[in-house]
Amino acid sequence: GITIPRNPGCPNSEDKNFPRTVMVNLNIHNRNTNTNPKRSSDYYNRSTSPWNLHRNEDPERYPSVIWEAKCRHLGCINADGNVDYHMNSVPIQQEILVLRREPPHCPNSFRLEKILVSVGCTCVTPIVHHVA
Amino acid sequence: GITIPRNPGCPNSEDKNFPRTVMVNLNIHNRNTNTNPKRSSDYYNRSTSPWNLHRNEDPERYPSVIWEAKCRHLGCINADGNVDYHMNSVPIQQEILVLRREPPHCPNSFRLEKILVSVGCTCVTPIVHHVA
């Protein structure tokens, strides 16, 4: 395996709670700044599997606002602009990392948490179960 | 904004870096458990805007492995199984939080970082620019 030497300038880890509790710098570095991603802001309307975005707000979590996608239809929009129920609109899910205040209401103490979010929808061919 | 009363049992915040540096409990709590068990999907193959998944690994980041979606086609798959270039396959992107070791190779000091990931693809009607 790749052996990583320990940096001699590392913070002290004598804390009795180490390694469960560590220091995290919240000055967020944004790796996306120089890239120019195509704006996906109107895909939710232009998609053949359009979705609505629901605001999920939790002041005890960072980020406190997460937008959840909910597919508008069971089927997909066809070329005529009608819903085709021979196809299915399904949510694309992703597990993400968030910080939760712990104990609650503490401004500088958090716990890592994984949550599952729906990011958008895609149109798929349905799985047809044939009854013998 | 929502005012949150400060919990009297909160850790001390006298650190000169506060509130930039906070304590984080790394024993990850999984909010998805039981309420929302994960169900495997092959949407990436069954979608009208199918995608491939590329493994992005960085041992200095948590999560170390992130799977990036890349749309297989510029167009979308039609009912005949052919690519229809009158429609566009586009990536659905999401900004996620990751933890990065800082300084590098330190086991107990991290910085939050935002990165943009492509989670999957969706089929959209193209924006047609008419030349006068």
Partner: antibody, heavy 126, light 107 residues
Framework: EVQLVQSGAEVKKPGESLKISCKAS????????IVWVRQAPGQGLEWMGG????????DYAQKFQGRVTITADESTTTAYMELSGLTSDDTAVYYC???????????????????WGQGTTVTVSS | EIVLTQSPDFQSVTPKEKVTITCRAS??????LHWYQQKPDQSPKLLIK???SSTSGVPSRFSGSGSGTDFTLTINGLEAEDAGTYYC?????????FGQGTKVDIK
Amino acid sequence: EVQLVQSGAEVKKPGESLKISCKASGGSFSSYGIVWVRQAPGQGLEWMGGITTFFGATDYAQKFQGRVTITADESTTTAYMELSGLTSDDTAVYYCARDPNEFWNGYYATHDFDYWGQGTTVTVSS
Amino acid sequence: EIVLTQSPDFQSVTPKEKVTITCRASQDIGSELHWYQQKPDQSPKLLIKYASSSTSGVPSRFSGSGSGTDFTLTINGLEAEDAGTYYCHQSTSLPYTFGQGTKVDIK
């Protein structure tokens, strides 16, 4: 290809402690987790606990809480499992296994144990 | 904790025969069920992950299906080398648990 090589067989007396090592090679050690699973003679598999090697966070089965300690040393790419207060019921083969530790995205995710060590036989007898 | 119950406990099968092992979870675990094969005096080996995803290097005769609480491991055309004990394992919630195992031997 990931390989996990465990330390050799141990014979212990009741009340003693045990520390088994699991040396990983191949892949990046901090990118995955290590779990410990044991198997008593003629019995099934039992999950004891695991560690997220990236930052040393641990999870333990309630049954072993307070008796088991799992650690990892990134510099040597080795995980350890220490079990104290041994009794004859702890006689078993102890396995370490890799937990891919990937975030769920519909198809790839964590907690299927895809590579296993060869096992360490532990006998507890007075 | 989530209890996994496998059936049967034991199966004696002739080569080329089809083998079906079931695993029932005490609550909904979605697709978070994995199957392992353990041969005598060997470490377990991952066969199927996430209920139905095959693992590289595993023969195509092994397949998995199911979701929720009921899962099946199928060996289509058993071979002599397939003798061993098969375990299911859930990773939905801690503590991770295994089924009691199904021993398959060759007639």
